[in-house]
């Protein structure tokens, strides 16, 4: 059965997944998909890495940790109820039937609504400013090749500002981890 993780509407969700590279920089391809892990690869891919880099992602999905050290935990930015469901983290270890598959269940709860003391609401509090690295047009799917002015370090730095670090640290201890080599 899937391990369950929770987040509120409007927050960032964190889905932990880790592996230990056999040697520094000796990376293994990883894919994240919406839906349970199928027979091979990931369906409905939202993000993937190859032996070197993040080579595909869709908007709102980030690897905030150091994926070069095996932290391939997924952050989903500004979640909605539609983000609920099972996610597949697949660590594609070479060989015969060596893939490690993890199904993680994300439960999104409605945001807690705090009644305003007066009729005039604080717009900033209700709609906090979101940091984003987008702004490259309407394309929903983008690859690193189409983002020449943003590097992985910048993406990671910006995304880290969005993460609730306490939640991340709490969840890290219960994350899916495997050791390679």
């Amino acid at each position: 059965s899937e391990v369950e993780y929770r987040a509120e509407v409007g927050q960032n969700a964190y889905l932990p997944c880790f592996y230990t590279p056999a040697a520094p920089g000796n990376l293994v391809p990883v894919c994240w998909g919406k839906g349970a892990c199928p027979v091979f690869e990931c369906g409905n891919v939202v993000l993937r890495t190859d032996e070197r880099d993040v080579n595909y992602w869709t908007s709102r999905y980030w690897l905030n940790g150091d994926f070069r050290k095996g932290d391939v935990s997924l952050t989903i930015e500004n979640v909605t109820l539609a983000d609920s469901g099972i996610y597949c983290c697949r660590i594609q270890i070479p060989g015969i039937m060596n893939d490690e598959k993890f199904n993680l269940k994300l439960v999104i709860k409605p945001a807690k609504v705090t009644p305003a003391p007066t009729r005039q609401r604080d717009f900033t509090a209700a709609f906090p400013r979101m940091l984003t690295t987008r702004g490259h047009g309407p394309a929903e799917t983008q690859t690193l090749g189409s983002l020449p002015d943003i590097n992985l370090t910048q993406i990671s730095t910006l995304a880290n500002e969005l993460r609730d670090s306490r939640l991340a640290n709490d969840l890290r201890d219960s994350g899916a981890t495997i050791r390679i080599g």
């Epitope: 349970a36 199928p38 027979v39 091979f40 990931c42 369906g43 595909y56 070479p94 015969i96 060596n98």
Partner: antibody, heavy 123, light 108 residues
Amino acid sequence: QVQLQQSGAEVKKPGASVKVSCKASGYTFTSYYMHWVRQAPGQGLEWMGIINPSGGSTSYAQKFQGRVTMTRDTSTSTVYMELSSLRSEDTAVYYCARDLYSYGFYYYGMDVWGQGTTVTVSS
Amino acid sequence: ETTLTQSPGTLSLSPGERATLSCRASQSVSSSYLAWYQQKIGQAPRLLIYGASSRATGIPDRFSGSGSGTDFTLTISRLEPEDFAVYYCQQYGSSPITFGQGTRLEIK
């Protein structure tokens, strides 16, 4: 055009092994997974396993584990399926089939098939 | 193992009629992982539908797929003479990949 060309028919004795080849052309060989599916006379389709031509990783149906080996030769864009310890129930047409799934197109389905290789196991 | 049960086993219809083929899974299958194939005698199968409802390249729009969970349907809106064949559903959701036993569509 995209094509999968399989090797010719084989007749084998029980206990022997057979190796079927499947040569791909018309596309980037290492960009698509390849399946092996068999069909016994008058029967339905049975999945045997899959190989990733890029790295050579494989996954086999449990029914065939220990008897089947799938390999590839990237220099000739060819995949191979070897089945050992043959028995009469292995008499079938063996197909290789390319999967749709590829970088940027994350859907599943066997979109290109070889013409099939008939393997007859008889004493 | 996910078992796919197709019904009916044989369907007898005339050209121009509508055909509805059913595929029921023993456990829930994501629609992303469900495909349909057509096979004619002496030929390799041909992919018709992937992702439960997306037509493969070159497939006429009289073929359509639908369904989710455990119940999926292939519909042929107006049968043409070349549509009489055996049809298989297939799932990728759990290992091994499995096919239904097939529905034989024959001319009435």
